[in-house]
């Protein structure tokens, strides 16, 4: 026999049927010109030592065969001795180790197969009614074809899947979904209505993530309040990756899973924006004012469900940074400037009352004084801090107050609002002998002392109401009762306590009358 | 090799119709083509139909032609002939055969490696 035809003999080697499941597959067989046809397959296993014929009965019975010796494609044209224009039905045996492999079987045409092309390019995936839709170009000239998918997850076989007869310019698929696990697919394609026409070859591998991305598994932790006011979140636990099927692992487009981080800032409420969206690599810089983050998974079909925590207020207090000075026409506070042109954000509290209750103000921007000092001024009409109570002041600032990340915290105190002089005035003075020529005073703690770096001292007055002789006294913020020695007996005494802070005098208490008895001896 | 078990003949009366099977056991069904020979009493045995191992491919005696249907089913591992329009001259020992690779005819007994036992198919006038 020549090369160039189809053998009617019997095949040159031994009927010997392996049975193994390795060998030749994917045997694709069309016309590649006017006169000429091709047949290609793919073999699986060891290749050393393998012969390949192409084997072929014609519709009258007979049978040939061409030796491919170790290629695993063939050409021959329409002389060849197979018959193209009926059905005939090919096969590829393969002689190896003294055993003959059968691949599967093509019955087909000849001269009406056309070589088909798996789906090229962009295959496009969304999602519609809780199923899987795949659109993609019908590659050039071969409108009309059957389709067929294949998917795996990572830890199933390949399952086989029918997309149905396709008939225009685009073509598309519905293919199951899964809701946890993401998949691989591939495409091929045969001519429509030609019975026993070749597949094409798989498609490139096409990922597709799971319907839910996977929920964040991630900590996070918060560093200390830096000088600048600032503190860095951290990412103790970076999100667990998605387990890809094989032919997705590496380059897997399609199915990543994008981590965003939802900042939420918690204090401050009057300033222009609440929240920002960063990417989770890009972990920022917070002020010490409360937060909420969320981590949001997402992926082509949108987002997943989220983890939110909670980042509270940073509660460290500075001495003395703030100076306020309470005047006839109001009440202004005066703190170090950060720099030019700050905005400033200031958040005042009642002690001791939910965090919702907070108020704020926004500054408008504002250089530094010539003593380098910000400032903030309030009319006593306004209402602000104009209870007589602890308040909680944040003093936040931004060169750029419109960009969340960028706040930092200036500092954090207390303040006693209202008329602070009368109203940290101490009340229930008393006077108790204690020795001969000394007396022990008492009185309540100063409404100023629920403010933690309020009260800045007690002071005892002692005036001797014959001489007009006045002695003061200063008493630590933490005491409530003094002894003043040095007394005469049978002098008439007043005793007065008043509670001073920082920046303001308090106002006296009710003068207390007292005299030491003089002792008779007997 | 396969075994193959033949079952379904019997005496019928001309015009009718039979339907024979045959299981096979042993090695993988769907790797063998699969045929029907028949032996009538002094006759050589002949070639009366067969089919490829996908199941398309069909191939009949000039005699059974249009009459006779092969078909497969590979998850059932049996091989079928649907006999209709039965003539006297269709009796004989009908023989289910299995080659796992074809020689240069279809319809070349040589080829056909393992036979069943046959089912005796007798058409009376």
């Known amino acids: 026999c020549r090369t160039s035809e189809c053998c009617f003999q019997d095949p040159p080697y031994p009927d010997a049927d392996s049975g193994s499941a390795s060998g030749p597959r994917d045997l694709r067989c069309y016309r590649i010109s006017s006169d000429r046809y091709e047949c290609s397959w793919q073999y699986e296993g060891p290749t050393a030592g393998v012969s390949h014929f192409l084997r072929c009965c014609l519709s009258s019975g007979r049978c040939c065969y061409f030796a491919a010796g170790s290629a695993t494609r063939l050409q021959f044209s329409d002389q060849a001795g197979v018959s193209v224009l009926y059905t005939v039905t090919l096969w590829v045996e393969s002689w190896a180790r003294n055993q003959t492999e059968k691949s599967p079987e093509v019955t087909l045409q000849l001269y009406n197969s056309v070589k088909y092309e798996p789906p090229l390019g962009d295959i496009k995936v969304s999602k519609l009614a809780g199923q899987l839709r795949m659109e993609w170009e019908t590659p050039d000239n071969q409108v009309g074809a059957e389709v067929q998918f294949r998917h795996r997850t990572p830890s199933s076989p390949w399952k086989l899947g029918d997309c149905g007869p396709q008939d225009d310019d685009t073509e598309s698929c519905l293919c199951p979904l899964e809701m946890n696990v993401a998949q691989e697919f591939q495409l091929r394609r045969r001519q429509l209505g030609s019975q026993g026409s070749s597949w094409s070859k798989w498609s490139s591998p096409v990922c597709v993530p799971p319907e839910n991305p996977p929920q964040p598994q991630v900590r996070f932790s918060v560093e200390q309040l830096g000088q600048d006011g600032r503190r860095r979140l951290t990412l103790k636990e970076q999100p667990t990756q998605l387990e890809l099927p094989e032919g997705c692992q590496g380059l897997a487009p399609g199915t990543e899973v994008t981590y965003r981080l939802q900042l939420h800032m918690l204090s401050c409420p009057c300033k222009a924006k609440a929240t920002r969206t960063l990417h989770l690599g890009k972990m920022p810089y917070l002020s010490g004012a409360a937060y909420n983050v969320a981590v949001i998974s997402s992926n082509q079909f949108g987002p997943g469900l989220n983890q939110t925590w909670h980042i509270p207020a940073d509660t460290h207090t500075e001495p003395v940074a703030l100076n306020i000075s309470v005047g006839t026409n109001g009440t202004t506070m005066y703190w170090p400037a950060r720099a030019q042109s700050m905005t400033y954000c200031i958040e005042w509290q009642p002690v001791g009352q939910d965090g919702g209750l907070a108020t704020c103000s926004l500054t408008a921007p504002q250089d530094p004084d010539p003593a380098g000092m910000a400032t903030y001024s309030w009319s006593r009409e306004s209402g602000a801090m104009g209870q007589e109570k602890c308040y909680y002041i944040t003093i936040f600032a931004s060169a750029h107050p419109e960009k969340l990340t960028l706040w930092s915290t200036v500092l954090s105190t207390y303040h006693f609002g209202g008329n602070a002089s009368a109203a940290g005035t101490p009340h229930h003075v008393s006077v108790k002998n204690h020795s001969l020529d000394s007396v022990s005073v008492d009185w309540a703690p100063s409404l100023l002392s629920t403010c933690p770096g309020v009260l800045k001292e007690y002071v005892v007055r002692c005036r001797d109401e014959d001489s007009k002789q006045v002695s003061e006294h200063p008493v630590q913020p933490t005491e409530t009762q003094v002894t003043l020695s040095g007394l005469r007996a049978g002098v008439a005494y007043t005793v007065q306590v008043r509670a001073d802070t920082a920046w303001l005098r308090g106002v006296w208490s009710q003068p207390q009358r007292f005299s030491i008895e003089v002792q008779v001896s007997d | 090799q396969v075994q193959l078990v033949e079952s379904g003949g019997g005496l019928v009366q001309a015009g009718g119709s039979l339907r024979l099977s045959c299981a096979a056991s042993g090695r993988t069904f769907s790797s063998y083509v699969m045929g029907w020979f028949r032996q009538a009493p002094g006759q050589e045995r002949e070639f009366v139909a067969a089919?490829?191992?996908?199941?398309?491919?069909?191939y009949y005696a000039d005699s059974v032609k249009g009459r006779f249907t092969i078909s497969r089913d590979n998850a059932k591992n049996t091989v079928y002939l649907q006999m209709n329009t039965l003539k006297p001259d269709d009796t004989a020992v009908y023989y289910c055969?299995?080659?796992?690779?074809?020689?240069?005819?279809?319809?070349?007994?040589?080829?056909?490696?393992?036979w069943g036992q046959g089912t005796q198919v007798t058409v009376e006038p």
């Open positions: 055969a299995a080659a796992s690779r074809v020689g240069v005819s279809i319809s070349q007994s040589s080829s056909y490696t393992s």
């Open positions: 089919i490829m191992r996908n199941g398309i491919m069909t």
